[in-house]
């Protein structure tokens, strides 16, 4: 026997590490991805490494350097935006982030004719919302919740709006609970196609009642920041959608567009605005109960100068049991004739499919069909439709992109991603050109992403955009840990895990378990994508069994499981988690007496519960910034999935499904509680019952607040954050430190 | 009763000027849109200025340049400044207005809620 000294083994495995917390912290093994800024059918703009904004013409191979970093640096610009006309673009400095999509900037204009700023008549600052027209140079701007048009940068701006308030009338933005739940964006105001007319939504907000917390700061005395923000069952914001002409803004002015009759009868809410021509316009309106939507199809009539909404043009979408939509009732993709359109909602099976609208809704044509569904549809043109699903091999945390021609009969489909890199890629998104020209695909995983270029014609692929190289070689000598993705099925429901092992993993040893948990209505959180994030270092070097559980209630796999919750939150998805970490144990690896359970916002209510469900399973757990009681979160989120919290609708489960009402029950675990104080979306408050409630019961428990921090808990709170939860769950796990 | 009166028509040769005047009562004028609209002999309407209630104008490419709507809201009344006139600008000139609507109050019959008699301009050498 010749004994050799361990250096002589330069085997991969001794020369491999661990992944490390500080990896996670640093962003060490983070990814990019390349979304071109498209600009025509055949040219994108793309700030590249140094700074410089550059155009791409895909034809010709050339590209150009448009704006130099130097122009960038002189007013410390982050933004740009170029003007259709490409006379102009504009600078964004000073970015001050408001809430998750809101945020206020300067903005400069550069001539790019003249290679200056454009002097007098600049814009004030901060401004709330700035964008150019779709064709030539308009400027549309929201300026302390009023609306301004300029026809040219240089000219002064005309006033569109003279109501706005803070806090209490809000033009051409969301207030606080439409920008979060309802439309997802920073603006409410959308340019015709051409730019002839703006429509803008005015919010008001008079009637709601004010969320105050404490902003601490480094004053002598804390602030006190004041949101209108409606909780389940309170005063909601009174919504009107206007238009006005931006060739003659002065002419009649704003016009509102008419709410259907059968909207208008009681509370409801504007959801989406879809430019169809310049004379014709697509808005859709949800019942405050919100199991019906209404689309409402909208004609300019000159010779009034009104807009027309008539009751052939309404079409209705209902859902009898559940909601409307999925997370937001889906927007339609219009086709050529500009009056029928493709339209995504459930089919008779129950799953959300493409259909297609030439008249009514009822004779909709059912353009895809199967147990899987649609997600999203990218872009009509004359003879493609081209969409995502999660159809292939029916696994349900997948997303390829497929073409429909719509030019031939029958349909063809083709699937554009299924086969590309299938090992690599399961996760896609795409970008198209104009008249889908060419696209980008930018895959998200499970392998290392990549952003590649492909011709809209023949689907083959052009060049790599971004293949994150650098990526590659820094996690060559990392021991990531393994994933794999399977299901288990429990009385007839379908539960899809994603489990994260140890690089050594050996079935025949016990393992601690940590299940991480989000569970909300819609959500999906067993997905094929690339990640090395927290519960990867757990895994890595931790050498912990992290599970990821897909419940009642979470998305794409049908309206069984998604409206199963419905008007229950609280019960099926906790049961499911439980169920689930039974099965995880039946496998015969994990130790039982090592299993705990983390999630955050409504994973944290989801964990919450779990722990205080008095199974035994959980050893301990963590919730960051729960919800502890629904009444206590927003009214457009909230009543989607319960109904009102009065007694005659669904008081009843609004109390009993709180995380106070079962206190006693956290006696036998160890619970760390977390939440930022200047939370805006699940407020502290929530946070600070149950430490009353485990108070009042005498039950111990562990807690962490952030100062001054929102529901993201970023910046140097990150690190604390998950330096502390790694100490937490290391000695609830008894390793070593 | 809302009451719209124009005066100020009249014969005028090409390049001369005029001033049209319109009296409004019956309504609160402030915050209302206002208009000049004309008819040529044979020929359909066609608006020739607006200035709405925060007093900013707009004109067609037609007349840009050469008329110039006003409105004196202590007087209740609207003006139309008209210059360097042609023989195309020969027709009656109507003062119009149009009230801003009320919540849920966006039905109309037409452009403009109430109209005056008119007034006629010729331009003639």
């Known amino acids: 026997i010749v004994l050799r000294p361990s250096r002589v083994h330069n085997s991969e495995e001794n020369t491999m590490r661990a992944l490390t917390l500080k990896d996670i912290l640093n962003g060490t093994f983070s990814y990019k991805t390349f979304f071109p800024n498209w600009i025509s059918g055949q040219e994108y703009l793309h700030q590249s490494a140094d700074n410089n904004i550059v155009l791409y013409n895909i034809e010709t191979g050339q590209s150009y350097t448009i704006l130099s970093n130097r122009t960038m640096k002189s007013v410390n610009a982050s933004n740009y935006g170029l003007s259709p006309d490409r006379q102009f673009v504009y600078l964004e400095s000073d970015y001050s982030k408001l809430w998750r999509y809101s945020y206020t900037a300067t903005y400069y204009i550069y001539d790019l004719s003249n290679g200056e700023f454009v002097r007098g008549n600049e814009l004030p600052r901060p401004i709330q919302y700035l964008c150019w027209s779709p064709v030539g140079s308009k400027l549309a701007y929201v300026y302390q919740n009023n609306i301004y048009l300029k026809q040219r940068p240089g000219d002064p701006p005309f006033q569109i709006t003279f109501n706005g308030r803070e806090n209490k009338i809000f033009n051409g933005i969301p207030d606080w609970v439409y920008e979060e739940e309802m439309l997802a964006t920073k603006y409410a105001l959308w340019w015709s196609p051409n730019g002839k007319f703006l429509a803008y939504a005015e919010f008001n907000d008079t009637d709601i009642p004010v969320i105050a917390y404490s902003y601490y700061g480094d004053e002598q005395y804390p602030r006190t920041i004041n949101i209108p923000y409606p909780k389940a069952g309170a005063k909601n914001p009174v919504v009107r959608i206007f238009i006005i002409d931006t060739t003659y803004p002065a002419y009649v002015g704003p016009q509102e567009v008419p709410v259907p009759a059968m909207i208008a009868s009681s509370d409801y809410y504007f959801s989406w605005l879809t430019w169809v021509t310049d004379e014709r316009v697509c808005l859709q309106w949800l019942k405050r109960v919100q199991n019906v939507s209404v689309l409402s199809i909208c004609d300019f009539r000159e010779d009034w100068q009104t807009w027309d909404c008539p009751k052939t043009q309404e079409h209705i979408e209902e859902s009898r049991t559940g909601w409307a939509g999925g997370f937001f009732v889906s927007t339609p993709v219009f086709s050529y004739d500009a009056i029928s359109y493709y339209k995504i909602f459930s089919d008779k099976d129950g799953y959300k499919h493409i259909h297609y609208i030439k008249d009514t809704v009822e004779n909709a044509i059912q353009i895809t069909s199967g147990k899987w569904e649609a997600i999203n549809i990218f872009r009509v043109t004359q003879d493609s439709l081209f969409y995502s699903s999660n159809e292939f091999e029916e696994y349900p945390g997948r997303r390829n992109i497929y073409r429909i021609s719509i030019g031939s009969y029958p349909p063809s489909k083709k699937c554009v991603t299924c086969h590309l890199r299938k090992e690599r890629c399961q996760y896609y998104t795409a970008s198209f050109s104009d008249y889908a020209k060419y696209y980008a695909l930018v895959c998200y995983g499970p392998g290392i992403p990549i952003s590649t270029l492909h011709d809209g014609r023949t689907d083959q692929e052009i060049k790599i955009l971004e293949e994150n190289k650098e990526l590659e070689n820094a996690l060559k000598n990392i021991q990531l840990p393994k994933e794999e993705i399977k299901k288990l099925e429990v009385d007839e429901i379908t539960l899809w895990y994603k489990m994260i092992l140890p690089p050594q993993f050996d079935r025949s040893k016990k393992y601690p378990l940590l299940i991480q948990v989000y569970g909300g209505p819609c959500s999906q959180s067993v997905r094929s994508v690339f990640a090395v994030n927290w519960i990867s270092y757990l895994a890595s070097k931790e050498g912990m069994v992290i599970a990821l559980v897909d419940g009642r209630g979470t998305a794409f796999q049908g309206d069984k499981l998604l409206y199963a919750v419905y008007r229950k939150l609280g019960v099926y998805e906790v049961e499911d988690q439980i169920t689930a970490v039974r099965k995880f144990i039946e496998m015969g690896f994990i130790d039982e007496k090592r299993i705990a359970i983390w999630g955050w916002s409504y994973g944290g209510y989801v964990s919450s519960l779990a722990l205080a469900s008095g199974t035994g399973l959980f050893k301990c757990g963590i919730a960051v910034a729960p919800v502890s009681s629904w009444e206590y979160y927003a009214s457009v989120y909230t009543e989607r999935f319960m109904g009102l919290p009065t007694k005659d609708d669904n008081l009843e489960h609004y109390k009993n499904s709180t995380v106070m009402a079962r206190a006693e029950y956290f006696r036998n675990v160890d619970y760390l509680l977390i939440h930022g104080t200047a939370d805006d979306n699940v407020h502290f408050q929530n946070s600070a019952q149950i430490a009353k409630a485990l108070v009042n019961a005498q039950v111990d428990f562990q807690a962490m607040w952030y100062s001054d921090q929102n529901h993201g808990l970023s910046g140097l709170s990150t690190n604390h954050l998950y330096t502390h939860m790694t100490h937490f769950l290391k000695q609830c796990f008894s390793l070593s430190d | 009763e809302v009451q719209l009166v124009e005066s100020g028509g009249g014969l005028v040769q090409p390049g001369g000027s005029l001033r049209l005047s319109c009296a409004a009562s019956g309504f609160t004028f402030t915050p209302t849109y206002m208009y000049w609209v004309r008819q040529a002999p044979g020929k359909g309407l066609e608006w020739v200025s607006a200035?709405?209630?925060?007093?900013?104008?707009e004109y067609p490419d037609s007349v840009k340049g050469r008329f110039t709507i006003s409105r004196d809201n202590a007087k209740n009344t609207l003006y139309l400044q008209m210059n360097s006139l042609r023989p195309e600008d020969t027709a009656v000139y109507y003062c119009?207005?149009?009230?801003?609507?009320?919540?849920?109050?966006?039905?109309?019959?037409?452009?403009?809620?109430?109209w005056g008699q008119g007034t006629l301009v010729t331009v003639s050498s």
């Open positions: 119009a207005v149009r009230v801003p609507p009320g919540v849920y109050t966006y039905y109309r019959t037409g452009p403009y809620d109430y």
């Open positions: 200035i709405d209630p925060y007093g900013r104008t």
